[in-house]
Structure formats: structure tokens, C-alpha cells
């Protein structure tokens, strides 16, 4: 190889071991018959060099920087050339290096050909190896603007008083251009701008100078998006840092076009302005630091433009003035990522704020708007407590649980309704009155309806679920000691034609100390399956439940376990069952953790069953499966 | 491994030659150069010569008019010839690899050479 | 030729302490981007072992207490923290263009 640099080109080109392979044959340049590491080769001189080694591309890089001077003359504008051309040189992985000093009145602006340019964060990579480091210069200090790929939306970046430009070209790439070139402009009196233009749905993800390391003390850097008209861009935040300020306050300053508060600043923890129509631009502006503990004041963000969708036009209103002590969240239902672009699902308060999930409280009318190719990609969370502080006045109290039909309109699925229903410890108990009879949840029965109760302790301390209901059973009500949470899951869309199905009161009445009691009324058409509360972890250490089941007059009820034995082995007290005819008090007791189970039993009056646990050994848990079915009577034994 | 040996005669009469072979093992002589160190009792090291890879040789021009180096590849041996010894020649001859950047990363024992009658 | 001229002809130092040998050569050095300065140990009976090549990279097996600066004509050789074994002779020397020089020495002790 022969490397020729012209007098007066202010070029250095530098070959120098790259990282080492593990490769076991070393690779030297060879030179006058010696044998070096490294060549450097400065303007006006020849240098004839070969290699020892067939692949140098393995062992070695060259390096090729450009000092451009344009404070003591004329600085040459224009298309920026690779010089030497990549042909002259050995097919190592090759960085160009163009490092501009200018003084601080001078702007300097890096205009990219197409494709754009795309910045990457720490430990990315571009897919085709073609890197572009920027860096600019305040005093003499250097600040990383960023590291790019090609194929984005970055178009112009303006910096003044210098700038340094690195190209990465692996060994086998083919580009023999920089794909750029320098302009001046005037003072932009700020550390630098960067113009990123999109031209149709995408998305752009930014950084602050020198992520993710501390953007420079009391700073301003400038982002300016060229959106279509027709298209709406949302900025969200990824991940940020303040630092401590001293004076001052770190901020996010947006220029909206048709915006009356221009500039609109925000906080960095404040949500992002969404929606937004045409071009805009956002200014990071930093503060002055605390001298012994300056923190770091550091944004990665990203900025999604799509289409409008039809119901970002449409308003509407969420009306909870009239509610108390409730929540309602928007936000994304869980799903798989795919690597497509995928446009951004937001919901907007006043059209204007809008991000991936909001939460709504009570007390306040809400105007809300979507800004969302997809709405099933979206779903809503509501949770609102119930709670009584004085027995004296809520005892025989009831309220309806039902979603508010404003809830109901939305055009975002409901996933779950949560009443948190908390009463006096030892004061009072509830019970759950549903508008249709329910139906327990089992594996040998399940739910098919588009909507189910889950009802469960919301004692902290207690892990105690009762199950799972929906419409259609047998259970008139369910009786609980003390506080627990009513969830109304959704499963289907259908929910909103189902919706009239709902309905369940709740009433605060005389305490009581079994921890829940179901009563059951079964149809005479059907098999009742009820299990014991907690399945698959079994029933807390000393619970006590009950079923009040109902015998009508003209059947009899049979009453069947689903194992032998109970399986439960007791560490501390005894697991013992009662079955106890109502009308003649005759009770038989078994011993949970010793006896079978009883035979199949027939009853001819209502009849109650008690479970009652000991604390039992871990692994060894009491879950217990049964079934009621009536059926005709055939002998009056009365 | 990388090793030199050198050997020679050990007792070299004033006005006679000298003859030292260095034989090489672990790397190639058409890959690396072999330079001649020399070390009087007491004193430093003085640079003899060297013969490069291919095979072009290098002397100290003190001592150009009497000296002369030479390999064979494929014995993988570099041989020192000098002429008119005296007993200021009295010293420790090296040979020692030129590996890159010019440093002389591997050396022989040595081969102590005296000059007396 | 290019003349090394070694600096102290000897030192000693207490064990953990800094040494600090320095070579001046007549002329640079560098040459393709390269300072062409080694540096070698040798102790009594034995051949010079290679310290430091290219003025600052250490050679294969060499413990990192070794270290080497400098650029054009002045280059100097540390050791830090001094050990027992460190008592040697050192010599510098260029390899920018033949005939290939050597410094003096400089004889290492300990105090």
C-alpha cells in the first residue's frame, strides 16, 4: 500500500491495532523491513507499507482526521469529501474524522443527504455498522451530541464555536461518501439544535448531550420536528435525571404553532404535550448545579407522529363530581412486543396532555380524548372504596355496586371494577346480595359469562380468596366477617350488552365471626359445584365457613365430596366438618384430617355444612370440592 | 515457545576468527530479524548487527570491516563471522529476536567468547 | 549516531518507594507515530529481559509496577512500588534507526 498526503491537507491518517482478537497469529505492519504496531502518516509525506498477514482487517484500523481551521480564514463550506478516497486506502474498518474549530460567534450546521440519521444509545449498534459520533465543543470542554445510525429522521444538527464529526465504515463497506455537508449560519446562542423531519407515520427516539452521562451545566439544546400538517406527534418521556439546582430551574420548553402560551414549559416529571399538529420545537434547559452534590440532569425521549385517529376528534366526558374515594385508570392491556413500528396508543386529558395511561380521580368532571389507531389496545381499571367509619349509622345500610353507566360509554373495554368494602374490626360484617343468584367458578363447571365477581379478603395480612362468581347459579348471598374487595373482571366485549346483568348490594349488618357464609337456593335443573375458599392454596390456618343450603319442600338434595379424604394434616388443632339438618339440629361431625369424607348423602330439609380448619402443615392444605344436586321426591318420610 | 541458543568456541586466539551460531526454534527466520549483542565483563551492551527476514544485514559501523552475519532458513540458524579478534573482544555474545516495534523481545544465554593466547 | 544518555549511572531505593530512571536520547526518536525507546533489565548472569517497548508498552509477563513514559528525545522508566527482586542493572534503548544504541545503565538497589 501506498499512502500519499498533500502538503497543506491538514490530514493525519493513523493505523493501530484495533481490539484483540484472539486470533493466535499476530499481525504486524511491515515497513522497511521492520515490523511496528502502529503508522501514523501526517500531511506532505509517502509512506509504502504492507502487511505481515493476509486479513489486517482482523488485527487492524485506520483512523483518518481532518482538522478544519476556520478561525484564521475562510472555512470551505460545501459537500464534505472522504479524502483519501476509500479506494486508496487498505480495507481496514476506517473512521473519518472531521474536527472543525470555529469561533463562538459562528454557527456550524452538519446537513445530512438522505437517508437521515437515526441516534442510538449506550450499547447499540447500527445493523450495517455505519456509525456517525457528533460532538461539539463548549470552551474547552468536548460534549457528546450523540451516536446515529443511517435511516432516521435526523436531518441538520447546528452547533457553534467547533464541532467534531466521526464516520464509522466497517472493512467491507462499499460508501466512498460522507453524506453530509457544512454550512455556516449565524449565532445560535445555545449549545446546539437538532432538526429531525419526518414524512409520514414514524417514530424518533432523542437524547440530551452527553447521555447518559450529566448534560452540561446551565445549557440549552433544541430539538425541532418537521411534521406534516395532517399528522399528530406526542412526545413522551423514557427515562430521566434532575440534578440539584442551585439557581434556576431545569425545565422542557415546547413552541407550539397556534399554541396562545408559547413557549409552554413543563417540568420533567410532568406529563408531555400530545396531539400536536404540524412542526414544533422542544428546548432542554438546564440549571445552575450545586457546586459539592451537582447530580445529573441527563432525558432520553421519544417522539411517536401518526395519523389522527377518528376518535382524537371526539370529547368524552367523565363525570365523578358525584363520586367519592374512586379511581379510574386508562392503560395499555398487556402484550407482546413486536419489532414493527407499532403506532403509540394515548389517551388525552383536554385533548392536550396525553400519555400511554391516565388515572381519573373523583370529585371532578373529566373531558378525555384518545389518540389511538386501536382501542382494544387499551383497557380501564376502576377501584372505588366503600367505607364505614361508625357502625351506629351504617348498620342495615346498603349500596348498589354497579359501574356508572359514564364509565359504560367509553369506548375503552373495562378489565376490572374493584369496591374496596371496609367496615369496624369486630363491629360489623357484610353481606353480598347479587340481582341474579350466582355461580362459583370451577374447573368442573366454569364460568362462561362475559363478566365474574372476585371476591376477596382485603385484610393486608389475610390471603384469603373466596372465588370467583358470575350470573346464573345458585349462591342468593355471601356473608364475610370483614373488609374485602368485590372485583367485577370483564372477559368479552360483550360485557356492554350483558351490562344489565350486574348488579350487587352490599349491606353492612351485625358482626359475626365465621369468616363467610354462602347461602345457597339450588335449581332443581341443576348440579351445584361450591369449593372451599382459597383453592389451590387452601383455606387459612383456623377458618371457619359455611353453606345454608335450601332443600325445597318436594326434593331431596345430594350431597357428594370430590375425593376420600380431605388430605389436610393438622400441625396445631383439629380440621372437622359439621353436616346439620336445620329443622331437627342432628349434626354428624367428621374429623378432616383423620376420617374419609362421607359416602354421597341424601337430605330432605335444608341443611348447613361447616368447615373449620386447624393450622395445618405446609403442603398438606385443606381444599375440599362438592356438589348439591335435587332431585323429585319419591316417599313423603315426613 | 520462542528460544535462542547460541554456541561458540570459548577461547579465541588475538588475530584469529570467530564463529557463533544461533539456532532459533518457535518462530520463522524469513518472518523476523536476528540481531548480535555483545556484553564486555562489567560493562554494557553494544549493538553487533542484524540480518532482517529477508535476509539483508545491518552492521555497527565500527565494526563493519570485520563482521558478517548469515542464516540458514530452513536449518533455522544464524551464524556471526568476525575477524582479527583482540582482547578488548572479550565478551558475552547475545542474539536476540527483532520483534515489532523494533524491541529485541527474546534472548539467548549468551555464549562467553575470550580472546588470550 | 543516535547517542542514550542515561540517568542516575546508579540509584537506590527503599522498598515500596517510586524509582524513576531517565534516558536522553540525541535526537527523536519517533518515527511513523512511534517512539522506538525499550527499555531492559538484567540481572547478574543473566541475558536482558524486555521491560517496556514502544517507550510505554510492556512486555509479555512484565508486572504492571513497570511502566514506561516519554515521547521525542526524553523518556524515563518507573517502578512503583520497588520490590526485593527489582535490583538489576536497566538499560534504554533506540530502535529508530541502526546502528541500534544502547543507554549506559543505571544500577538499581535497594536502601
Known amino acids: 500500500f501506498e499512502i500519499a498526503l498533500p502538503r497543506e491537507s491538514n490530514i493525519t491518517v493513523l493505523i493501530k491495532l484495533g481490539t484483540p482478537t484472539l486470533l493466535a497469529k499476530p499481525c504486524y505492519i511491515v515497513i522497511s523491513k521492520r515490523h511496528i504496531t502502529m503508522l501514523s502518516i501526517k500531511s506532505g509525506e509517502r509512506i509504502v507499507f504492507t502487511f505481515s498477514c493476509q486479513s489486517p482487517e482482523n488485527h487492524f484500523v485506520i483512523e483518518i482526521q481532518k482538522n478544519i481551521d476556520c478561525m484564521s480564514g475562510p472555512c470551505p463550506f460545501g459537500e464534505v469529501q472522504l479524502q483519501p478516497s476509500t479506494s486508496l486506502l487498505p480495507t481496514l474498518n476506517r473512521t473519518f474524522i472531521w474536527d472543525v474549530k470555529a469561533h463562538k460567534s459562528i454557527g456550524l450546521e452538519l446537513q445530512f443527504s438522505i437517508p437521515r440519521l437515526r441516534q442510538i444509545g449506550p450499547g447499540e449498534s447500527c445493523p450495517d455498522g455505519v456509525t456517525h459520533s457528533i460532538s461539539g465543543r463548549i470552551d474547552a470542554t468536548v460534549v457528546r451530541i450523540g451516536t446515529f445510525c443511517s435511516n432516521g429522521t435526523v436531518s441538520r444538527i447546528k452547533m457553534q464555536e467547533g464541532v467534531k464529526m466521526a464516520l464509522h465504515l466497517p472493512w467491507f463497506h462499499p460508501r466512498n461518501v460522507s453524506g453530509f455537508s457544512i454550512a455556516n449560519r449565524s449565532s445560535i446562542k445555545r449549545l446546539c439544535i437538532i432538526e429531525s423531519v419526518f414524512e409520514g407515520e414514524g417514530s424518533a427516539t432523542l437524547m440530551s448531550a452527553n447521555y447518559p452521562e450529566g448534560f452540561p451545566e446551565d445549557e440549552l439544546m433544541t430539538w425541532q420536528f418537521v411534521v406534516p400538517a395532517h399528522l399528530r406527534a406526542s412526545v413522551s418521556f423514557l427515562n430521566f435525571n434532575l440534578s440539584n439546582c442551585e439557581r434556576k430551574e431545569e425545565r422542557v420548553e415546547y413552541y407550539i404553532p397556534g399554541s396562545t402560551t408559547n413557549p409552554e414549559v413543563f417540568k420533567l416529571e410532568d406529563k408531555q404535550p400530545g396531539n400536536m399538529a404540524g412542526n414544533f420545537n422542544l428546548s432542554l434547559q438546564g440549571c445552575d448545579q450545586d457546586a459539592q452534590s451537582p447530580g445529573i440532569l441527563r432525558l432520553q425521549f421519544q417522539v411517536l407522529v401518526q395519523h389522527p385517529q377518528n376518535e382524537s376528534n371526539k370529547i368524552y366526558v367523565v363525570d365523578l363530581s358525584n363520586e367519592r374515594a374512586m379511581s379510574l385508570t386508562i392503560e395499555p392491556r398487556p402484550v407482546k412486543q413486536s419489532r414493527k413500528f407499532v403506532p403509540g396508543c394515548f389517551v388525552c386529558l383536554e385533548s392536550r396532555t396525553c400519555s400511554s395511561n391516565l388515572t381519573l380521580t373523583s370529585g371532578s368532571k373529566h373531558k378525555i380524548s384518545f389518540l389511538c389507531d386501536d382501542l382494544t389496545r387499551l383497557w380501564m381499571n376502576v377501584e372505588k372504596t366503600i367505607s364505614c367509619t361508625d357502625h351506629r349509622y351504617c348498620q342495615r345500610k346498603s349500596y348498589s355496586l354497579q359501574v356508572p353507566s359514564d364509565i359504560l360509554h367509553l369506548p375503552v373495554e373495562l378489565h376490572d371494577f374493584s369496591w374496596k368494602l371496609l367496615v369496624p374490626k369486630d363491629r360489623l360484617s357484610l353481606v353480598l346480595v347479587p340481582a341474579q343468584k350466582l355461580q362459583q367458578h370451577t374447573h368442573e363447571k366454569p364460568c362462561n359469562t362475559s363478566f365474574s365477581y372476585l371476591v376477596a379478603s382485603a385484610i393486608p395480612s389475610q390471603d384469603l380468596y373466596f372465588g370467583s362468581f358470575c350470573p346464573g347459579g345458585s349462591i342468593k348471598q355471601i356473608q364475610v366477617k370483614q373488609n374485602i374487595s368485590v372485583t367485577l373482571r370483564t372477559f368479552a366485549p360483550s360485557f356492554q350488552q350483558e351490562a344489565s346483568r350486574q348488579g350487587l348490594t352490599v349491606s353492612f349488618i351485625p358482626y359475626f365471626k365465621e369468616e363467610g357464609v354462602f347461602t345457597v337456593t339450588p335449581d332443581t335443573k341443576s348440579k351445584v359445584y361450591l369449593r372451599t375458599p382459597n383453592w389451590d392454596r387452601g383455606l387459612p390456618s383456623l377458618t371457619s365457613v359455611s353453606w345454608n343450603i335450601s332443600v325445597p319442600r318436594d326434593q331431596v338434595a345430594c350431597l357428594t365430596f370430590f375425593k376420600e379424604r380431605s388430605g389436610v394434616v393438622c400441625q396445631t388443632g383439629r380440621a372437622f366438618m359439621i353436616i346439620q339438618e336445620q329443622r331437627t339440629r342432628a349434626e354428624e361431625i367428621f374429623s378432616l384430617d383423620e376420617d374419609v369424607l362421607p359416602k354421597p348423602s341424601f337430605h330432605h330439609h335444608s341443611f348447613w355444612v361447616n368447615i373449620s380448619n386447624c393450622s395445618p402443615t405446609s403442603g398438606k392444605q385443606l381444599d375440599l370440592l362438592f356438589s348439591v344436586t335435587l332431585t323429585p321426591r319419591t316417599v313423603d318420610l315426613t | 515457545e520462542v528460544q535462542l541458543q547460541e554456541s561458540g568456541p570459548g577461547l579465541v586466539a588475538p588475530s584469529q576468527s570467530l564463529s557463533i551460531t544461533c539456532t532459533v526454534s518457535?518462530?520463522?527466520?524469513?518472518?523476523?530479524?536476528v540481531n548480535w549483542v555483545r556484553q564486555p565483563p562489567g560493562k554494557g551492551l553494544e549493538w553487533l548487527g542484524m540480518?532482517?527476514?529477508?535476509?539483508?544485514?545491518d552492521y555497527n559501523s565500527a565494526l563493519k570491516s570485520r563482521l558478517s552475519i548469515s542464516k540458514d532458513n530452513s536449518k533455522s540458524q544464524v551464524f556471526l563471522k568476525m575477524n582479527s579478534l583482540q582482547t578488548d573482544d572479550t565478551a558475552r555474545y547475545y542474539c536476540?529476536?527483532?520483534?515489532?516495534?523494533?524491541?529485541?523481545?527474546?534472548w539467548g544465554q549468551g555464549t562467553s567468547v575470550t580472546v588470550s593466547s | 549516531d543516535i547517542v542514550l544518555t542515561q540517568s542516575p549511572a546508579s540509584l537506590a531505593v527503599s522498598l515500596g518507594q517510586r524509582a524513576t530512571i531517565s534516558c536522553r536520547a540525541s535526537?527523536?526518536?519517533?518515527?511513523?507515530?512511534?517512539?522506538?525507546m525499550n527499555w531492559f533489565q538484567q540481572k547478574p548472569g543473566q541475558p536482558p529481559k524486555l521491560l517496556i517497548y514502544?517507550?510505554?508498552n510492556q512486555g509479555s509477563g512484565v508486572p504492571a509496577r513497570f511502566s514506561g513514559s516519554g515521547s521525542g528525545t526524553d523518556f524515563s522508566l518507573n517502578i512503583h512500588p520497588m520490590e526485593e527482586d527489582d535490583t538489576a542493572m536497566y538499560f534504554c534503548?533506540?530502535?529508530?534507526?541502526?546502528?541500534?544504541?544502547f543507554g549506559g545503565g543505571t544500577k538499581l538497589e535497594i536502601k
Open positions: 536476540a529476536r527483532d520483534g515489532y516495534d523494533g524491541a529485541m523481545d527474546y
Open positions: 518457535g518462530f520463522s527466520l524469513t518472518g523476523y530479524g
Open positions: 540480518i532482517w527476514g529477508d535476509g539483508s544485514t
Open positions: 535526537e527523536s526518536v519517533d518515527n511513523y507515530g512511534i517512539s522506538f
Open positions: 514502544a517507550a510505554s
Open positions: 534503548q533506540q530502535s529508530k534507526e541502526v546502528p541500534w544504541t
